[in-house]
């Protein structure tokens, strides 16, 4: 194929691939008609002047995962047709000025996973057609003003996984076409007001895993097209009341792993496209009325692992589409009987790992479609008569690890549980805590007359049997976080997000048999 170097493979489609540790320099002669050239996993340490001079038709050039640490300014001369250039995963510390001069057709430039210490305005001043610039995974500590001023057509800019401590409010001002901006995993402590004002077409903004403590009230007010906003794993302690007010297109918002102490009413919205909101691992202590009232399409709300001790009766007003509510691992002692009244479509609720001492008899009164209720590891001694009677779809109920008081008052609950045993699961059953003579015995099979011989047990109407199915629970298992290493380690550069590091397999979703769409 017009002379293919022995250390390369050349296809009929003008594609050349050169790989292997034995390669220490750009192979020659390269086929003059090559349109795609990949040089991967070699021991090439430098690119000298014009090694690609005779392949001027080249459209894509990937020089990745090599030992490349030095490039001569004229290395890419005569590649005027080049649209895609990747130098990712090398050992570049410095980019020579003028390196990309003459690459008038260049649309994608990947410089990620190198050791770049700085970039300058002159580096990209010739790249007026650039649409994508990947700089993540380098050692950049600051971005000088003007660095991107000539990249007016840029749609995707990734600066994640660097060492940026601050951002100038002017650095992105000319990027009116930018759709994706990623700044995750840096050391940013604050974002100056106006930083994103010029980004009127921005659709995704990734700021997760920084050290941001405060958000300016109008930080996102010009970003009306923003669809995905990642703010998780920062140090945000409060949200200015209007910070999310101008984001009507938002369909993903992550705020978990911050230091939020409170949420003001109406803080979210209007966000008619937001279907999931993850707020776990914050310091939220209470939920006021109407705090989520603008989120009328929300389907999943995760509030687990906070310090919530009080939920106002109208806190969940407006959440008419909510399907899953996770409140586990908080500090709840009591719940108002009306707190879930508006959640007519709720299917899964996790309340485990709280301090609930009792539940109002009407707590689930309007939530007729509930399929899974997690109440394990609370301070419950009994439950009100008929609390689950109307829940014909209930197929999973977790009640273990509560200090059940097995006196005569427990009989109605015991009888109902006896008739609905499959819903309790097979892993752990609820056991008596008191009186002492029955401690540790199964609540389901305990003989209440033996437990309290001195008390006359009156005829008490038992909980009616509700339908269950031989194969229940017939809904999918929810194991929130696998403990496998690939899930608990941080996500690599190009996935652009980070998994949380936890090993407790119920720690986030907190539902073990809950149904899922």
């Amino acid at each position: 194929y017009h002379g293919c170097p022995s250390e390369c493979t050349c296809s009929r489609a003008s594609q050349v691939e050169c790989t292997g540790a034995r390669i220490v320099a750009v192979p020659t002669p390269l086929p003059w008609n090559a349109m795609s050239l990949q040089i991967l996993n070699t021991h090439i340490t430098e690119l000298n002047e014009s090694p690609f001079l005779n392949i001027s038709a080249l459209i894509a050039l990937r020089i990745e995962k090599n030992e490349l640490s030095r490039i001569t300014p004229g290395a890419f001369r005569n590649l005027g047709s080049l649209r895609y250039l990747s130098l990712a995963n090398n050992k570049l510390q410095v980019l020579p000025i003028g390196l990309f001069q003459g690459l008038d057709s260049l649309e994608s430039l990947l410089l990620s996973s190198n050791q770049l210490l700085q970039i300058q305005p002159a580096h990209f001043s010739q790249c007026s057609n650039l649409k994508e610039l990947q700089l993540h995974g380098n050692h950049l500590e600051y971005i000088p003003d003007g660095a991107f001023d000539h990249l007016v057509g840029l749609t995707k800019l990734n600066l994640g996984k660097n060492s940026l401590t601050h951002i100038s409010p002017r650095v992105f001002q000319h990027l009116g076409n930018l759709q994706v901006l990623r700044l995750y995993e840096n050391r940013l402590t604050d974002i100056p007001m106006g930083t994103f004002d010029g980004l009127v077409n921005l659709q995704e903004l990734a700021l997760q895993q920084n050290q941001i403590g405060l958000l300016s009230p109008g930080l996102f007010h010009n970003n009306h097209n923003l669809q995905r906003l990642y703010l998780s794993n920062n140090h945000i302690s409060q949200l200015p009341p209007s910070v999310f007010m101008q984001l009507p297109q938002l369909n993903r918002l992550t705020l978990f792993g911050n230091s939020l102490k409170e949420l003001s009413p109406g803080i979210f919205g209007p966000m008619p496209n937001l279907r999931e909101l993850w707020l776990y691992d914050n310091h939220i202590s209470s939920l006021p009325d109407n705090v989520f009232s603008n989120l009328r399409q929300l389907q999943v709300l995760i509030l687990s692992r906070n310090q919530i001790s009080f939920i106002s009766p109208g806190a969940f007003n407006g959440l008419t589409e909510l399907r899953e509510l996770s409140l586990h691992t908080n500090a709840l002692q009591d719940l108002d009987g009306n707190v879930f009244r508006m959640l007519a479509n709720l299917q899964n609720i996790s309340l485990q790992n709280n301090r609930l001492r009792q539940l109002p008899g009407n707590i689930f009164a309007n939530v007729n479609g509930l399929m899974a209720i997690q109440l394990q590891n609370n301070q419950l001694e009994n439950l009100p008569l008929g609390i689950f009677d109307h829940l014909g779809k209930l197929c999973e109920l977790r009640l273990y690890d509560n200090p059940w008081r097995c006196d005569s008052d427990i009989l109605p609950l015991r009888n109902w549980l006896l008739l609905n045993q499959p819903r309790l699961g097979t892993d752990t059953v609820p056991v008596c805590f008191s009186p002492a003579n029955v401690r540790g015995q199964s609540l389901i099979i305990i003989n209440v007359n033996v437990a309290v011989p001195s008390v006359h047990v009156p005829e008490v109407p038992s909980y009616p049997e509700t339908p269950w199915y031989p194969d229940t629970p017939s809904y999918p298992d929810t194991t929130s976080v696998s403990s496998t290493t690939e899930l608990t380690s941080p996500v690599e550069d190009y996935t652009d997000l980070t998994t949380i590091q936890v090993t407790d397999d119920r720690s986030v979703w907190g539902m073990t048999q809950a149904q899922s769409g």
């Epitope: 279907r275 399409q297 589409e321 299917q347 809904y475 194991t479 976080v481 996935t495 997000l497 769409g517």
Partner: antibody
Framework: EVQLVQSGAEVKKPGSSVKVSCKAS????????IHWVKQAPGQGLEWIGL????????NYNQKFKGKATLTVDTSTTTAYMEMSSLRSEDTAVYYC????????????WGQGTTVTVSS | DIVLTQSPDSLAVSLGERATINCRAS??????????MAWYQQKPGQPPKLLIK???SLESGVPDRFSGSGSGTDFTLTISSLQAEDVAVYYC????????FGGGTKVEIK
Amino acid sequence: EVQLVQSGAEVKKPGSSVKVSCKASGFTFTDYYIHWVKQAPGQGLEWIGLVYPYIGGTNYNQKFKGKATLTVDTSTTTAYMEMSSLRSEDTAVYYCARGDNKYDAMDYWGQGTTVTVSS
Amino acid sequence: DIVLTQSPDSLAVSLGERATINCRASQSVSTSSYSYMAWYQQKPGQPPKLLIKYASSLESGVPDRFSGSGSGTDFTLTISSLQAEDVAVYYCEQSWEIRTFGGGTKVEIK
């Protein structure tokens, strides 16, 4: 361009296991749910379960609990489905698919992996 | 599980004519705002392709001759003017509870 590329066809003996991979590209892998769907020869579609790479969370159809295990490797943006104790009725095409939110429809699908169980 | 029953099993329609496929759920899959119903098209040897989500929302890139309607338990996929490339099997799917699919409707040209 959003792509889900699945591993090649497999022929397995009854009682053995198979692990099908689904390599994602063109989107932020951890930001979407990955579903798995079974289609037996000449049959309709059957939902196996989902995995959410963001936290590693899984949901299973009770029918496939104990049969299928869903995992992800976020470093390679790849989802896996392992099927154990294979029987002839596990012969099918298995698809991975992407969903934006947990209850959303599946907007992109892999090309499918044919698993044949035969002695 | 929610059972989805599609009708008819197969359908032969002339080019340019209207094709209508029905899907009935064994219980409601709708709220006041949304119906958790989707429609897919599958051609031989290919994976399913999403056409309609949330009962009536046309997926990006899908020709507007496809439309979806219905709520509660009864849903319809309509192809307003059948084209040769529309020959396929069509499936409905609900995500209200554990996801289930209809048995499929084969659309052919008369």
